[in-house]
């Protein structure tokens, strides 16, 4: 168990724990104090004791010892009084820290005393050696507990230069692979640096005498170190491994390292000392095996095999941990260690080896674990697990502390929990005690809640309630109890409505540049704070102040100016403080493809065959498969900025060989196309020019035609520049009269035409036009027939007759003309005709002529749309390219037809049962008018009750209809007639119904002169005629309000003029109908001095 921080009010004791101790190995130098450290924590206060070499050691009783008087410290310091005092205190120390709960133990601290380093007195003989031989200068420094550093110097304290030939070994000896006369010195001094004592001592100088020789003899390598052929060594896991090979020989050997048993771990291996030393960092099990050094020179080699065994000091797999336990629990301390060789594990309890304890103890040791069952407070102890092998020792202290604590609920009482329907609520009841208290949850009735399978308890006391329902709202009680006491808390649960997205956003596919709207509707519990937010690919979306990319409002997300980067998943997040629901939609942005990113030309050698290979990288398809790629070219010389398509290839292709034209400066580009259209084109390719070649095409549309009677103009469609196949092109034109088989005349021209002069009129010629450039001629051209210039035709068409088809159409026929008289290609016939006048009366108006062009192979024409009852003049002419020939003439007349519609039919209401119809005759009589036909019927009777009668007077302009119903509307139809029958009708609708009743003066106004006033109005179409009075009344004192006698006026009149008025006078005008006042207006006459005439065209009565 672990006592929670919130569990207050219980002062728990603590077993001893070592917090600080001296290192396992302590080397003391002559002038140093000895400090042995041992500190520990614990409640009650810890007592310390020491052992040396397993025997009780009392620091306080030793001379020169200072013990630190500190509650958590058992450390002490020994101060010496002479240089070798430390020798007396050498040994293995251990510290024990105890209180009433147990004893903790430090690791073994090995104290070693190091004396002042001295080189044993020796006489160093000179070393004599012949040039080229090898030599070893020994160093043999005194032994040291701490690593030391060796340097070789001369008496001037200059380092001896080391290289492949001269090397210091790890042992400090100086090795010469071969000596040179320049090595001859009497002061090779080995210096040993002891960092612990901060002293450097030096060996007696060695005198190296090198005898010169005239013949240095080459010899193969031999190892100076190690001297035997193989050696075995142990490397410690995690430590560095250093292997060394030093060889002699002449020339100087080089050293190589091999690992026959596997690969050399390059990341951890370094070679030093001119390859003589191999250092392997952080040795691991896999480094076990053979390492071989090879010394080579031109005469041979020598080798040494190192057989490395990797071993390891003990290390933890599972270190025992201190724990608190409640009564009755089982305590298990795991002590799993590894090492090579396998370490031996021993257990201690409170510092005493278990072997020395009484046999009736309740612990058992099983597979590296110390186990105590059913622990009680009296079983509290500190255990030690110690593992050792020949490479080291490992120690762990771990306590078993058995405590008794009353039950306590650490969760606050009377907490309110809120959760939504369908979710899971968690009611907390964190309880603690020793033994661990049992926890029960009860409802308001004191019944256990666990009868409902939706309620489930957790080991930590929490009660879970899944699939929450509204009626789960209420109070719940948590009861915690152990053998010392029991406690209760209450929890309130409120179940709210779950948030629901009633209509989420829908997945959609949209075009780039368009906008998309996602909508989201949700329902929330009314007591909770609602929120709707939007996420795009997991990122929160917000309207950005400086951009109108996103618009968010009322559950709507609008994304403007869609780009491909906007593609992704968009979700509406509806949330309250209790729950979050999310509805997701996918947005795919589609559009035309992206640009082709890269374009490369290859097989440029094919340019000589007018081909090249184009390859490109695929374009982004923007969610619509690429259907095709369009390959285009531009010629910057001939047509800059103009792109021509060379063809399209399927969308799964990314290269093609193109067929090109000679001498074109090709720059290519490729565009991807999908169903949304073409993308941006690729970057342009480099420009390549195809070699020149003779033309492969000749001009088309070759024609020969004269533009004068004595010439022939040969024309053709010039070759497009891309067909020139060279920088320029010319045209070889050949011609000869047709059928002569004589020689061709020819001329080479640059323009797309040639004028052949002095030709006879309308002679056929054979013509050929061939393209020519600097590389040669085009293919053999085709022969075209052309003609020299035409003259006006001399042929007159002979008329065969005119057939009258009806009153407005005739058929004209003529005989084909003699082609010899045409003087050119007969293009057809011009037929011209015009109306000379009606048969009724001849008009003097301007004559309008109509033309019909008839093809050469046709000798008749129907002239339609003629006016009936009219005289026409007709001319027919043959025509060729030059113009028209003489005309044949003829006159004909069209028979009578039916007339056009009468003009302007007006309805004038006479009473509520009678109407006056007023009209004008038709514009086109098309014959002799014989009268009119009038028909009418009520509109709402669907055409029943039609009345029709003939008005036989062609001069008639009005007709009065009586006995009409005042309640009906009628349809009136009036037709004029000739002997051919009635013509087109004019139609009006109306009746007396809407037109009688209250009179309407419409737009009425008055104007005045000096002595008169004109009142005018616009009569309403069909308004029944009526009579009314107009009264002029003068205003002002001197006028005395004098009135003129009222005048009777007819409505159809449209205006009335009142004379005999006073100048410069205001008048009121009153309008009466059947003594009822209908309208009033005012007018003022002008002052004197004006012409006293009324305006022209005004009627007076």
């Amino acid at each position: 168990i672990q006592i929670p921080e919130e569990y207050e009010g219980h002062h728990v004791m603590e077993p001893p724990v070592i917090t600080e101790q001296s290192p396992r190995r302590l080397v003391v130098f002559p002038t140093d104090d000895i400090s042995l450290k041992c500190e520990a924590s614990g409640k009650p206060e810890v007592q310390f004791r020491w052992t040396r070499d397993g025997v009780h050691f009392k620091p306080k009783e030793e001379l020169g010892v200072t013990v630190y008087q500190s509650p958590h410290s058992g450390s002490f310091t020994i101060t010496g009084n002479n240089s070798n005092f430390a020798q007396r205190f050498q040994g293995i120390y251990r510290c024990f820290a105890s209180n009433k709960l147990g004893t903790a133990m430090s690791h073994e601290i090995r104290l070693m005393a190091e004396g002042a380093p001295k080189w044993p007195k020796e006489t160093v003989k000179p070393v004599e050696v012949e040039e080229g031989e090898s030599v070893v200068l020994p160093c043999n420094p005194p032994p040291s507990a701490e690593p030391l550093r060796i340097y070789w110097m001369n008496s001037k304290i200059l380092h001896i230069k080391q290289d492949e030939r001269v090397t210091m070994g790890q042992n400090g000896n100086l090795y010469f692979a071969n000596v040179l006369t320049s090595d001859n010195h009497s002061d090779y001094i080995c210096h040993a640096h002891f960092p612990g004592t901060r002293t450097i001592i030096q060996k007696e100088p060695i005198d190296l005498r090198v005898k010169a020789t005239n013949s240095m003899i080459d010899r193969k390598p031999r190892l100076l170190f190690p001297t035997n052929s193989s050696s075995h060594l142990v490397a410690l896991q995690g430590q560095p491994l250093v292997l060394e090979c030093i060889a002699e020989g002449f020339p100087t050997p080089t050293i190589k390292w091999l690992r026959p048993s596997g690969p050399m771990p390059a990341d951890r291996v370094t070679y030093q000392n001119h390859n003589k030393t191999l250092q392997l960092l952080k040795v691991g099990e896999e480094d076990d095996g053979e390492y071989r050094c090879l010394a080579e020179n031109s005469l041979g080699s020598a080798r040494h095999a190192y057989y490395v065994t990797v071993e390891a000091a003990p290390y933890w797999l599972h270190k025992p941990q201190s724990h608190l336990y409640g009564p009755g629990e089982t305590a298990r301390l795991d002590c799993q260690v590894q090492g090579r060789p396998q370490p031996e594990v021993t257990w201690r309890i409170n510092g005493i080896p278990v072997e020395e304890l009484a046999k009736d103890q309740k612990y058992r040791i099983q597979r590296g674990a110390l186990i105590l069952s059913n622990v009680q407070p009296s079983d509290t102890m500190v255990t030690q697990c110690e593992a050792r092998n020949r490479h080291g020792l490992l120690l762990a202290n771990a306590y078993i502390y058995v405590v008794q604590l009353p039950a306590k609920i650490l969760t606050a009482d009377n907490q309110t929990y809120m959760a939504v329907q369908g979710s899971t609520a968690y009611l907390l009841c964190k309880a603690f005690g020793a033994p661990v208290p049992s926890v029960q949850w009860l409802d308001e009735d004191g019944t256990t809640v666990l009868q409902d399978e939706r309620f489930f308890p957790y080991a930590n006391g929490t009660l879970g309630i899944r699939d929450l329902q509204a009626n789960d709202t209420g109070r719940y009680f948590c009861l915690a109890a152990n053998d010392q006491n029991n406690v209760t808390i209450m929890a309130n649960l409120k179940v709210k409505d779950a948030t629901q997205i009633t209509q989420g956003p829908r997945s959609t596919i949209e075009k780039k540049g368009s906008r998309v709207t996602f909508t989201c509707q949700a329902s929330f519990d009314p007591s909770l704070q609602p929120s709707i937010t939007w996420r795009g690919d997991g990122r929160d979306l917000q309207e950005l102040g400086d951009s109108d990319k996103y618009f968010i409002e009322d559950g709507r997300l609008v994304i403007h100016s869609l780009d491909y980067s906007d593609q992704g998943n968009y979700s509406c997040v509806a949330s309250t403080e209790l729950d979050v629901v999310e509805s997701r939609a996918q947005l795919l942005v589609v559009g035309s493809p992206g640009p082709v990113p890269r374009l490369v030309l290859s097989d440029l050698h094919l340019l000589t065959q007018s081909q090249v290979r184009v390859s490109w990288s695929p374009a982004e398809d923007h969610n619509a498969p690429i259907e095709k790629y369009d390959i285009e070219f531009e010629d910057k010389e001939m047509a800059p900025e103009k792109w021509y398509s060379l063809g399209k290839v399927p969308g799964n292709q990314t290269s093609t060989t193109l067929k090109l034209s000679p001498y074109v400066h090709y720059t290519f580009r490729v565009t991807a196309i999908n169903k949304y259209g073409p993308g941006e084109p690729s970057p342009v390719s480099e420009t390549v020019v195809t070699p020149e070649a003779a033309p492969e095409k000749n001009p088309v549309d070759v024609k020969g035609e004269g533009n004068e009677t004595t010439n022939m103009v040969i024309t053709w469609k010039p070759l497009r520049w891309m067909d020139w196949n060279a920088p320029q092109v010319q045209y070889r034109v050949q011609w000869r009269p047709q059928g002569t088989r004589g020689p061709w005349q020819e001329q080479i021209v640059s323009d797309p035409f040639l004028v052949v002069s002095n030709t006879s009129t309308f002679v056929p010629y054979e013509i050929k036009v061939q393209a020519v450039n600097s590389q040669g001629k085009g293919p053999e051209p085709q022969v075209t027939i052309g003609y020299s210039g035409e003259d006006y035709p001399q042929a007159i068409p002979e008329l065969e007759g005119i057939e009258i088809l009806n009153s407005s159409a005739v058929l004209v026929k003529w005989r084909p003309v003699d082609l010899a008289q045409v003087k050119g290609h007969l293009r057809g016939y011009n037929v011209t005709y015009w109306r000379e006048g009606s048969q009724r009366k001849h008009s003097k108006r301007h004559i309008h002529k109509d033309h019909v062009v008839v093809p050469a192979n046709t000798t008749s024409v129907i002239l339609s749309g003629l006016r009936p009852y009219s005289s026409y003049h007709l001319e027919v002419q043959a025509f060729n390219g030059r113009g028209s020939g003489p005309a044949s003439e003829f006159t004909f007349s069209t028979p009578e037809g039916v007339p056009g519609h009468p003009e302007a039919l007006h309805l004038e209401c006479q009473s509520n049962t009678s109407l006056l119809l007023r009209w004008q005759p038709p514009l086109s009589h098309n014959g002799v008018l014989t009268g009119y036909v009038l028909s009418y019927h009520p509109l709402d009777e669907g055409g029943k009750g039609q009345l029709s009668f003939n008005l036989r007077d062609p001069e008639l302009r009005t007709h009065n209809l009586t006995d009409l119903s005042p309640h009906l509307r009628y349809r009136f139809q009036l037709q004029a007639t000739t002997k051919e029958g009635p013509g087109e009708a004019i139609v009006r609708e109306g009746g007396t119904m809407a037109l009688s009743g209250i009179s309407d003066f419409g737009n009425i106004s008055a104007t005045a002169g000096e002595n008169y006033s004109v009142v005018s109005w616009v009569p309403k179409e069909g308004q029944c005629n009526f009579r009314f009075h107009i009264l002029f009344k003068a205003l002002g004192e001197e006028k005395g309000g004098a009135s003129l006698s009222p005048q009777y006026v007819s409505y159809n009149q449209s205006s009335y003029t009142q004379w005999d008025l006073q100048p410069d006078t205001d008048y009121e005008i009153h309008l009466f109908k059947e003594r009822m006042f209908r309208h009033q207006m005012a007018v003022k006459t002008n002052g004197t001095g004006r012409v006293r005439l009324p305006p022209a065209g005004f009627a007076t009565e």
Epitope: L604, V684, E686, P691
Partner: antibody
């Protein structure tokens, strides 16, 4: 007359970068692609890459991909070649050359820039 | 990449001699081969393209021939000013590659 003038000699440390310039005159800079070629001491010619000064589109010899960057400045009619992660074998004379209008040939050359890479 | 192998790597001839340099491509390059002349301390200069077409301003004593994989540059009458190194170049495919060069000296 057509001229391509390159920047002066450079001495660089291994691992560093060098940027060589090539100023064009006497023709319309954007109408012709600029190619880069190098020549190691006593060795032959090696093509590095090209740039279209009109669109700045460039392509490189795969051997130099990732180490070479070709750029151009229309306003000064200058092309640039930058080579990074220099090694001793990059010691060479670097030439810019104008690509002939219709074929990948070199009709006008810069005077060359010597780049020495040495620690 | 297309390898261009030139031979000989150097030659020595007398003024007026006919000199022939050959260039072999590792694959068919049609006639997409050019020849350059580089005089000591100078920049290369285009002599021939399309294997045999003389570049403007190049003396007529220079000629080229060949197609496919084997190409030849011929100097019909060696002049002192022709002392230079000559390079062939293929432009059929990228990367553009050059021959190793042939150094021509006067005896």
């Amino acid at each position: 007359q057509v001229q391509l003038v390159q920047s002066g000699a450079e001495v660089k440390k291994p691992g560093s970068s060098v940027k060589v310039s090539c100023k064009a005159s006497g023709y319309t800079f954007t109408n012709y692609w600029i190619q880069w070629v190098r020549q190691a001491p006593g060795q032959g010619l090696e093509w590095i890459g090209y740039i279209n000064p009109s669109t700045y589109y460039s392509d490189y010899n795969q051997k130099f991909q990732g180490r070479v960057t070709l750029t151009a400045d229309k306003s000064t009619s200058t092309a640039y070649m930058e080579l990074s992660s220099l090694r001793s074998e990059d010691t060479a004379v670097y030439y810019c050359a104008r690509r002939q209008f219709g074929l990948p040939l070199f009709d006008y050359w810069g005077q060359g820039t010597t780049v020495t890479v040495s620690s | 990449d297309i390898q261009m192998t030139q031979s000989p790597s150097s030659l020595s001839a007398s003024v007026g001699d006919r000199v022939t340099i050959t260039c072999r491509a590792s694959q068919d390059v049609g006639t997409a081969v050019a020849w350059y002349q580089q005089k000591p301390g100078k920049v290369p200069k285009l002599l021939i393209y399309w294997a045999s077409t003389l570049h403007s301003g190049v003396p007529s004593r220079f000629s080229g021939s060949g197609s496919g994989t084997d190409f030849t540059l011929t100097i019909s009458s060696l002049q002192p000013e022709d002392v230079a190194t000559y390079y062939c170049q293929q432009y059929s495919n990228y990367p553009l590659t050059f021959g190793g060069g042939t150094k021509v000296e006067i005896k």
